[in-house]
């Protein structure tokens, strides 16, 4: 088919982050076309010569795909007709970070949008009471982080208190030699209080809460990706 009018179509992307070793999504939507065969999706990455992915005439066209993405990409083929050009990226690598372009051609015209994709490792922390310790102690553990995060403790009762003097944080390199296990211990814990262990790097922020009373222990965890425009 040919592009016969001088029109540009709206393409929208969302900055996102990928968790090393897991699958990620690079989000892209566009003004849909009525015929799937008239839609071409091209994903490009700055600095890469070949294509990240190409979808045209209703199927993947991977003859020009760059070696670094071979066998790791897919679009949601059944959703292309409704304007979803998002890319699924399998087994996210640290080197997948960078600027991507979602480039769309339809019978209505062309359009493109860039997105920043960050890569790293982030995981939910779990806070437990350390019964083996000599004093009341909390232990906050998160299995996979990269780059190295900061760990800050907070308490509901002692709001604004600095716990750096009564806590100890260590980072242990995992077997794949990239991500690290985060372990932080908080000493001199008082009963009837809620403590928060906050782990943060430039990709994600995670919080593990623990409420300790004489009768029960309640836990809650939360993870939030940073710099993702929702």
């Amino acid at each position: 088919f040919g592009i016969s009018g001088r029109h540009s179509i709206t393409v929208t992307t969302v900055a996102s982050a990928g968790n090393i070793g897991e699958d990620g999504i690079l989000s892209c939507t566009f003004e849909p076309d009525i015929k799937l065969s008239d839609i071409v999706i091209q994903w490009l990455k700055e600095g890469v010569l070949g294509l990240v992915h190409e979808f045209k005439e209703g199927k993947d066209e991977l003859s020009e795909q760059d070696e670094m993405f071979r066998g790791r990409t897919a679009v949601f083929a059944d959703q292309v007709i409704v304007g979803n050009a998002s890319l699924r990226l399998k087994n996210v690598q640290l080197t997948d970070a960078g600027t991507y372009k979602c480039y769309i051609i339809t019978s209505k015209g062309k359009g493109n949008a860039n997105l920043e994709y960050k890569t790293g490792a982030f995981s939910m922390p779990e806070v437990n009471v350390d019964y083996n310790a000599s004093s009341e102690t909390l232990r906050c553990e998160a299995p996979r982080w990269f780059p190295q995060p900061t760990v800050v403790w907070a308490s509901q009762v002692d709001q604004g208190a600095n716990f750096s003097e009564v806590s100890n944080t260590s980072f242990e390199l995992n077997s794949e030699n990239v991500t690290m296990k985060v372990v932080s211990v908080l000493y001199n814990v008082t009963i009837n209080n809620t403590y928060s262990c906050m782990i943060e790097n430039d990709i994600a922020k995670a919080t593990g809460d623990i409420k300790v009373t004489e009768s029960e222990i309640k836990r809650r965890s939360h993870l939030q990706l940073l710099n993702s425009k929702a």
């Epitope: 040919g2 592009i3 016969s4 490009l44 700055e46 600095g47 070696e67 670094m68």
Partner: antibody, heavy 117, light 105 residues
Framework: EVQLVESGGGVVQPGRSLRLSCAAS????????MNWVRQAPGKGLEWVSA????????YYADSVKGRFTISRDNSKNTLYLQMNSLRAEDTAVYYC??????????WGQGTTVTVSS | SYELTQPPSVSVAPGKTARITCGGN??????VHWYQQKPGQAPVLVVY???DRPSGIPERFSGSNSGNTATLTISRVEAGDEADYYC????????FGTGTKLTVL
Amino acid sequence: EVQLVESGGGVVQPGRSLRLSCAASGFTYSSRAMNWVRQAPGKGLEWVSAISSSGTTTYYADSVKGRFTISRDNSKNTLYLQMNSLRAEDTAVYYCARKRWYGMDVWGQGTTVTVSS
Amino acid sequence: SYELTQPPSVSVAPGKTARITCGGNNIGSKSVHWYQQKPGQAPVLVVYDDSDRPSGIPERFSGSNSGNTATLTISRVEAGDEADYYCQVWDRGMIFGTGTKLTVL
């Protein structure tokens, strides 16, 4: 200021070799793909070769395939073009240019290569 | 391989509009870039992605692309616009047009 500065040009006999260099500054060189483009005297622009940011992928024009090798040293912010088995038709001004998606957004001032006996 | 055809020359009076065409099979489905090259100087990108302008390039430079023809339009032409102009697309390598010499009368 973003800058590309080519060097290494000169007069060389047919069949001999020459290595061009391009020093990059003012941007994160290691994240950008790069190109060599040439222009014979009085002629138009001809793309020669491209290299990915990591240096793992390279493309060549048919006219230089098997004779020219593009490479880069990201620690030195430098792009290279090794030219072997030079021919008279390789005589040109050689430009290095930064790749931007499907085009080139920054060019060097060029270095002249003359292949003559 | 993919070919791009440009007129060898275009002449225009100062203050008028110059249009330089670039022909290629279904070029409308490709992203077209335009470069200006003055004698003894390196090329300069004046339009990218069919119609976008890099910072520092006057608004007088614009581009369009549809069907089998891409066009670089220079409005209110000045003497300093006299140069060679090249269109370019990517097709497993950079493909340049044959070049057009713009003469300001």
